[in-house]
């Protein structure tokens, strides 16, 4: 997150981190039920660990943290390169969470976000637009949902109904490492960090997010059948 601020501890209890090896954070994720996470399909890896209830970027133990393994990764069947439509993936964890003030699921929005809606994006991604400077703690940023027209004008031929744009204030954006993390509007999960331009946080190059209102049925059906 570029030019965000430290999240309040436990203010994003649905925020998850996907880790490679001992502690290499490579994507964000969102807790949507006691045993299921959502992340971006482009975050798929064969082996990873899941960390919930953690505020710091570092591996130092925190009392609210809970660690899990992913036992099933189910990317949306429509995700493909190079268009990046349908950029979402369900992850089933090896056990259910212990519900606490640090770890709680978030409800997915059934209605699509409208232009001007204020939302919160969060993550441990890089805080510099073109270099890997990672934050000490989880970062939060208020962003505004942009019109479909403005979104398509920013990225001609690259936007479809499975995406929405938000942000667009120069110097503020999600960035590398935030992928798969939550965009929460009015207390409900509206999107996932999907993609954007490089360097991050450029004028007229807003962040592009997976439009989760289009996938409520697929998410419910997939969880029920697995």
């Amino acid at each position: 997150i570029v030019n965000g601020s430290d999240c309040q501890k436990d203010a994003q209890p649905w925020q998850g981190a996907l880790l490679l090896g001992p502690n290499k954070l490579y994507c964000g994720a969102v807790l949507i039920s006691p045993q299921w996470l959502l992340t971006a399909a482009h975050c798929r890896k064969p082996v990873f660990r899941i960390r919930l209830g953690h505020h710091s970027m570092s591996p130092v133990y925190e009392s609210g943290q809970q660690m899990f393994q992913g036992i099933k990764s189910i990317p949306h069947p429509g995700y493909s390169h190079p268009g990046h439509s349908n950029d979402l993936m369900l992850i089933k964890m090896n056990r259910k969470i212990r519900d606490s003030h640090s770890v709680k699921p978030v409800e997915i929005a059934c209605d699509c976000a409208t232009e001007g809606t204020r939302c919160m994006v969060s993550g441990w991604g890089t805080t510099s637009s073109s270099h890997n400077n990672f934050p000490k703690v989880l970062q939060c940023l208020n962003i505004t949902v942009l019109s479909e027209e403005r979104c398509k004008n920013s990225y001609p031929g690259q936007i479809d109904k499975t995406m929405f744009c938000a942000g667009d204030e120069e110097g503020r954006d999600s960035c590398q490492g935030d992928s798969g993390g939550p965009v929460v509007c009015n207390g409900k999960l509206q999107g996932l960090v999907s993609w954007g331009d490089f360097p991050c946080a450029q004028r007229n190059r807003p962040g592009v997010y997976t439009n989760l209102c289009e996938f409520v049925k697929w998410i419910k059906d997939t969880m029920n059948s697995n």
Partner: antibody, heavy 127, light 108 residues
Framework: QLQLQESGPGLVKPSETLSLTCTVS??????????WVWIRQPPGKGLEWIGS???????YYNPSLKSRVTISVDTSKNQFSLKLSSVTAADTAVYYC???????????????????WGQGTTVTVSS | DIQMTQSPSSLSASVGDRVTITCRAS??????LNWYQQKPGKAPKLLIY???SLQSGVPSRFSGSGSGTDFTLTISSLQPEDFATYYC??????????FGGGTKVEIK
């Protein structure tokens, strides 16, 4: 300002291994989220991608050369290297190292363009 | 492999002319296309990335457009220093990264 410099022998015998090194100055090879790329250009011809290595030290090779190519990185020396085995006259070319700059973040991160290049080094394969 | 076809392979133009070079991909590459300029004996130089974004320091007379399979590089008013060979390049998630065959812009 980032600069790249290729080094290695200008003449290699057929069936031997071509070894080149690219030294990165003006920036760290490990601190930035970039790809490090080898490209070659046979005399009077177009550009051919050989392979790339990323910040995870994952390697990506041109399938037409994959069985003969190794790319590695040495962060302590701020260098990355190319080895091409069993060379023939068809491997005679100018070899360039370059930095691959991602075209975006997230789902767009694995797509890149080469924004900084070395000046190139000529390698001739001949006995 | 995705094939990149550039046309024309060469062209003659005068200073001040508007020059257009096209690049066609054998399948959709979204906006993942870059353009380079190469002068004799020199390394290529990135001009345009992501089909239409101008690389820092490149004159505004260069512009790029297109998405999917068809792309265009335009030089709005050719300058003496623009006589060179131009290459398009697609950057795939799956290798190989491939270049077009090049377009040589010569003085008429």
């Amino acid at each position: 300002q980032l600069q790249l410099q290729e080094s290695g022998p200008g003449l290699v015998k057929p069936s031997e291994t071509l070894s080149l090194t690219c030294t990165v100055s003006g920036g760290s090879i490990s601190s930035d989220d970039y790809y490090w790329v080898w490209i070659r250009q046979p005399p009077g011809k177009g550009l051919e991608w050989i392979g790339s290595i990323d910040y995870f030290a994952s390697t990506y090779y041109n399938p037409s050369l994959k069985s003969r190519v190794t790319i590695s990185v040495d962060t302590s020396k701020n260098q990355f290297s190319l080895k091409l085995s069993s060379v023939t006259a068809a491997d005679t070319a100018v070899y360039y190292c370059a930095r691959g700059r991602p075209l975006g973040y997230g789902a767009r991160h694995d797509y890149y363009g080469m924004d900084v290049w070395g000046q190139g080094t000529t390698v001739t394969v001949s006995s | 492999d995705i094939q990149m076809t550039q046309s024309p392979s060469s062209l003659s133009a005068s200073v001040g002319d508007r020059v257009t070079i096209t690049c066609r991909a054998s399948q959709s590459i979204s906006s993942y296309l870059n353009w380079y300029q190469q002068k004799p004996g020199k390394a290529p130089k990135l001009l345009i990335y992501s089909a239409s974004s101008l690389q820092s320091g490149v004159p505004s007379r260069f512009s790029g457009s297109g998405s999917g399979t068809d792309f265009t590089l335009t030089i709005s008013s050719l300058q003496p220093e623009d006589f060179a060979t131009y290459y398009c390049q697609q950057s795939p998630y799956f290798p190989p990264l491939t270049f077009g065959g090049g377009t040589k812009v010569e003085i008429k």
